[in-house]
């Protein structure tokens, strides 16, 4: 069936596309557990249409319902580093402001060296995702095995 | 950049989404390590409304960003023949045209029998999807267990 | 903010944004692999915008294609339990009206704690998703754990 | 092996403070998340404090709410309990306990405790 | 706040015997059920995890059952080593659990 009649439209901005996938750029220092992501198509094939990084954190634009889903690959693993290291954990949630701060998806990395979710949640405008991987292991920086993104899905 | 003066509306139907999803039909020969899928409603749940397959792999007709995701499940497993037959790898990437080649998603089956990721990730008119499954074990065909698909998200 | 003035443009309701989070109430009965889900604000990041609950399953309300998602954390689970207790397997499934019966997504639990997958199938108005857990191991409550949406993609 | 050893009870003055620790080591401590339970002498079991794994989470019993501030530092494996403002039904022996799952959340299902350590509150 | 309620606070039996505790929540809490024994002066000890499902190391002959409101702790046959308090927990809360007020076995 026709979505629409012709007459009938929407402006294209005001559906609120905001969307991004960012690649790793690094760890934090000793203390820091958090994953620092860039993004940009200078970079490949990551992009940030909408939220912005502030200090390597993404940081959402408008207020809505987002799919947020992450993929992270531990480095130097197999079966048996990352049981022998095990566990490393990681965990997706809104860090600041301070009074928003809540975890929002959590995963440990049991006897496998990859996690893999996503997940539907309200943000607003000024909230900041933080992706903090617990664990001795490093993870990988390769662009198709470790990536973070959300997508604005409604008000 | 702004996405469209107020004055210049879409049709809804224009915002093109294309969507796509596939189940598994048969694996290649001997030394071709891609997945054939298949769509349609004869088949069950499948379907592709704007993407086409060719010769099993999925092209894409319409340029924006996409989420892809995949869930691949080994046929005859168990965590001890999961880590006897490692390492198995599946990788989702453009694999045509030559130009545009690139690897966009990869996970490896570490003692589990079931990978499951997504990603969103810009896509052109006439790329091709390639899933390839490398290593010794056959993925299960069953179509709540093993299926490939793609979703237009924004231009 | 108002996404458009009705003249000129689609009322959002019929975009059919319809779209659920949900969270763990319970598990069923001993005889029961069912979960039971739980939504809506006062629970905290859980919602439902057009599906609905019944007896703590999710009820489709709009015909479409739906984006179903789900990740599932075992709660007395580490590494050396999880394999003790496998098999372990959570399936999501259309279980009314009967006739239109159907598993839709199915994983199993090996050597792991966490499940995640997601995929895209059509619903109808009137479709029941059931999420069944089969095994000995309890399902953790914890919001950023276990979790189970949906989200309609197209019609 | 995994041991837990608490350490930091002793006798206080109502409306005193003080700062239990607990020592953790055999397992990886971060991965954990961590619990206070108490027993009053001759009495039962009421559980006071838990902390997630990375430190994120952290959940108080109604009974000490804004009086106990529980926190980890994962650099030392060690895992605290200040307590302020005590009070005469504060005194029990204190216990730490871990949860069973490695996820880092807290589930309540505690598998492992240390020995506990006495605090008495009393004038 | 969920509460756990148990009886009987105490009971008297002989080695051989076979021992029934019950547990009753204020609130259905589906399987999120534990039990746990804790001997004089010892740190307690987790038996029965989701109701009916025994912790590593502990011995067949403690068995638990029930679900929603009402469950039920066994010893088949008690030993010796079994005279301790035991004690009900729910975990169904994500907030806070609590504990029932504890069972006394006691040498008749």
């Known amino acids: 069936q026709r979505f629409a009649q012709a007459q009938q439209q929407l402006p294209l901005e005001s559906l609120g596309w905001d969307v991004a996938e960012l690649q790793l750029n690094h760890t934090g220092p000793q203390q820091d557990p958090r994953l620092y992501w860039q993004g940009g198509p200078a970079l490949g094939r990551s992009f940030l249409h909408g939220p912005e990084l502030d200090k390597g954190q993404l940081r959402i634009h408008r207020d809505g319902i987002y799919m947020v889903h992450i993929q992270v690959t531990l480095a130097i693993c197999s079966s048996t580093t990352a049981s022998r290291h095990h566990p490393t954990t990681l965990a997706v949630g809104i860090c600041s402001p301070a009074s928003r701060s809540i975890s929002l998806l959590r995963l440990s990395f049991h006897q496998g060296c990859t996690i893999a979710s996503q997940r539907l949640t309200p943000l607003a405008r000024g909230d900041t995702l933080c992706t903090n991987l617990t664990g001795t292991l490093l993870p990988s920086r390769n662009t198709d095995e470790t990536f973070f993104g959300v997508q604005w899905v409604r008000p | 950049q702004r996405f469209a003066q107020a004055q210049q509306q879409l049709p809804l139907e224009s915002l093109g989404w294309d969507v796509a999803e596939l189940q598994l039909n048969h694996t290649g020969p001997q030394q071709d390590p891609r997945l054939y899928w298949q769509g349609g409603p004869a088949l069950g749940r499948s379907f592709l409304h704007g993407p086409e397959l060719d010769k099993g792999q999925l092209r894409i007709h319409r340029d924006g960003i996409y989420m892809v995701h995949i869930q691949v499940t080994l046929a005859i497993c168990s965590s001890t023949t999961a880590s006897r037959h490692h390492p198995t790898t599946l990788a989702v990437g453009i694999c045509s045209p030559a130009s545009r080649s690139i690897s966009l998603l990869r996970l490896s089956f570490h003692q589990g029998c079931t990978i499951a990721s997504q990603r969103l990730t810009p896509l052109a008119r006439g790329d091709t999807l390639c899933t390839n499954l490398t290593g010794t074990l056959l993925p299960s065909r069953n179509t709540d267990e093993t299926f490939f698909g793609v979703q237009w998200v924004r231009p | 903010q108002r996404f458009a003035q009705a003249q000129q443009q689609l009322p959002l309701e019929s975009l059919g944004w319809d779209v659920a989070e949900l969270q763990l109430n319970h598990t069923g009965p001993q005889q029961d692999p069912r979960l039971y889900w739980q939504g809506g604000p006062a629970l905290g990041r859980s919602f439902l915008h057009g599906p609905e609950l019944d007896k703590g399953q999710l009820r489709i309300h709009r015909d479409g294609i739906y984006m179903v998602h789900i990740q599932v954390t075992l709660a007395i689970c580490s590494s050396t339990t999880a394999s003790r207790h496998h098999p372990t397997t959570l399936a999501v499934g259309i279980c009314s009206p009967a006739s239109r019966s159907i598993s839709l997504l199915r994983l199993s639990f090996h050597q792991g704690c966490t499940i995640a997958s997601q995929r895209l199938t059509p619903l109808a108005r009137g479709d029941t998703l059931c999420t069944n857990l089969t095994g000995t191991l309890l399902p953790s409550r914890n919001t950023d754990e276990t979790f189970f949406g949906v989200q309609w993609v197209r019609p | 092996e995994v041991q837990l050893l608490e350490s930091g009870g002793g006798l206080v003055q109502p409306g005193g403070s003080l700062r239990l620790s607990c020592a953790a080591s055999g397992f990886t401590f971060s991965q954990y998340s961590m619990s206070w339970v108490r027993q009053a002498p001759g009495k039962g079991l009421e559980w006071v404090s838990a902390?997630?794994?990375?430190?994120?989470?952290?959940y108080y019993a109604d009974s000490v709410k804004g009086r106990f501030t529980i926190s980890r530092d994962n650099s030392k494996n060690t895992l605290y309990l200040q307590m302020n403002s005590l009070r005469a039904e504060d005194t029990a022996v204190y216990y730490c306990a871990s949860d069973i799952s490695d996820s880092g959340g807290s589930h309540w299902y505690f598998d492992y405790w240390g020995q506990g350590t006495l605090v008495t509150v009393s004038s | 706040d969920i509460q756990m309620t148990q009886s009987p606070s105490s009971l008297s039996a002989s080695v051989g015997d076979r021992v029934t505790i019950t547990c009753r929540a204020s609130q259905y809490i589906g399987r999120y059920l534990n039990w746990y024994q804790q001997k004089r002066g010892k740190a307690p000890k987790l038996l029965i995890h989701g109701a009916t499902s025994l912790a590593s190391g502990v011995p067949s002959r403690f068995s638990g059952s029930g679900s929603g409101t009402d469950f039920t702790l066994t010893i088949s046959s008690l030993q010796p080593e079994d005279f301790a308090t035991y004690y009900c927990q729910q975990s169904y809360s994500t907030t806070s659990p609590t504990f029932g007020q504890g069972t006394k076995v006691e040498i008749k």
């Open positions: 902390i997630s794994g990375g430190g994120v989470s952290t």
